[in-house]
Interface confidence: low
């Protein structure tokens, strides 16, 4: 199977992505997310589907989720705001905004993240950076630690073969290659960033991870801007 | 080296419940799933459930619904299954197992007969 | 409910032949299947996951394949050691649910 971290990824330098969160469920890590705003969180609304009767808040400034480091901190949530087109079923619109309790105190491990804007699809081959504490293999062990993986973006029409997704890939998402290095259970929500962008939030639709016919769908926050703008607003 | 220890053998009255164990060495539970099947005598596997050792989570398929309860003790690493109102149909080997797209590891099995 | 079904419940073949197990799943599972070895009064092993990828340790004689509702095993060059019930399981990508085939006993002739 699959070695390393992500899959086939590997153990990310400790708080070089300022921008990286935890979403957690009753003191465990659920899913990711990305600090795009001082009082806001992205990540999938599909994660609030496991979260309806406990307690969700968001980490911040973490390398492992175990140990004391001197940046982490715990925020209660205000305020969750799925995209009001998100349904269980799909895939499509699987974009959750969470409001922090309090403004992040922000520092060289706690940032916001610049979010891609123009809505223009990232040219295929393009290497893309996704990070996340889910499934590090197959046997489904998962870090303490922070695991990140490059993945090359995929062309939507490569995306959409029937071996593929099979046309289920619209305008609003986006593909990265998959073959044996992928994101997977648990970096759900958790950012695509291409350079230096955050071009795609990882989508927790199922699908078998690292496998190359069934590449990586991420949703791409450029459409989604008016919305992320309204709720920020 | 990764092993899954069961309990021994146990032989049971109809109506009455059993508990087994699944002792995990090797490697920590809260890092995995762990499952539980059923194999009757000359027959074929069935799964009953999973138990996500770190939160406590379960998922049952709906034939073991009311039926099974897994449970798990991490401080012993431990992995549980409970069957209660017992009857013939429960005599079987139960296999306690570790993984999430595949069962990668396997205990050796617990046999449980219910006889009057 | 998804139901695996392997139509052969036997099958029978020679040292050095080349033999194929099925299981036809009851709607899509994309490549959510995994194959399993059970030899006589032992604990099943685990061969194949994700339709395709071997378990590390397994001998590349087996090969898994399929897609959507039909999943073949195949070991080519059957040596003796192979003689043993073969079952194919699917599962869910959520919930994680999971359902395994009837069996296909292998016998060497």
């Known amino acids: 199977p699959p070695r390393g971290r992500i899959l086939g990824g590997r153990e990310a330098e400790a708080h070089a992505r300022p921008y990286m969160a935890s979403v957690q469920l009753n003191g465990a890590h659920l899913c990711g997310g990305v600090l795009v705003a001082e009082q806001w969180v992205l990540s999938a609304a599909h994660c609030l589907e496991d979260a309806a009767d406990g307690k969700v808040q968001v980490l911040l400034g973490a390398h492992s989720l175990s140990q004391p480091e001197p940046s982490k901190r715990l925020y209660d949530v205000l305020r969750a705001v799925p995209h009001p087109d998100s349904q269980p079923d799909t895939i499509d619109h699987d974009l959750l905004l969470l409001q922090l309790s309090e403004k992040a105190t922000l520092g060289p491990a706690v940032r916001p993240l610049p979010w891609q804007r123009v809505d223009r699809d990232v040219a295929p081959g393009t290497l893309c950076d996704v990070a996340g504490w889910g499934i590090v293999n197959h046997a489904g062990r998962r870090p303490d630690s922070l695991q990140h993986v490059l993945l090359p973006v995929l062309d939507r029409a490569t995306c959409n073969r029937r071996t593929h997704h099979d046309g289920a890939i619209t305008e609003r998402l986006m593909c990265a290659e998959s073959n044996r290095r992928d994101s997977c259970k648990g970096d759900s929500g958790g950012p695509l960033v291409c350079g230096g962008v955050l071009e795609g939030v990882v989508t927790s639709g199922s699908r078998v991870c690292g496998n190359r016919k069934k590449p990586g769908i991420y949703t791409r926050v450029a459409s989604y801007a008016a919305w992320i703008d309204s709720v920020l607003a | 080296e990764v092993q899954l220890q069961q309990s021994g053998a146990e032989l049971v009255r109809p109506g009455a419940l059993v508990k087994l164990s699944c002792k995990a060495s090797g490697f920590n539970i809260k890092d995995y799933y762990m499952h539980w099947v059923k194999q009757r005598p000359e027959q074929g596997l069935e799964w009953i459930g999973w138990i996500d050792p770190e939160n406590g989570h379960t998922i049952y398929d709906p034939r073991f619904q009311g039926k099974a309860t897994i449970t798990a003790d991490t401080s012993s690493n431990t992995a549980y299954l409970q069957l209660s109102s017992l009857t013939s149909e429960d005599t079987a080997v139960y296999y306690c197992?570790?993984?999430?797209?595949?069962?990668?590891?396997w205990g050796q099995g617990t046999l449980v007969t219910v006889s009057a | 409910d998804i139901v695996m079904t392997q139509s052969q419940k036997f099958m029978s073949t020679s040292v050095g032949d080349r033999v194929s197990v099925t299981c036809k799943a009851s709607q899509n599972v994309g490549t959510n299947v995994a194959w399993y070895q059970q030899k006589p009064g032992q604990s099943p092993k685990a061969l194949i996951y994700t339709a395709s990828y071997r378990y590390s340790g397994v001998p590349d004689r087996f090969t898994g394949s399929g897609s959507g509702t039909d999943f073949t095993l195949t070991i080519s060059n059957v040596q003796s050691e192979d003689l043993a019930e073969y079952f194919c399981q699917q599962y869910n990508s959520y919930p994680h649910m999971y359902t395994f085939g009837g069996g296909t006993k292998l016998e060497i002739k």
């Open positions: 197992s570790r993984g999430l797209l595949g069962f990668a590891y």
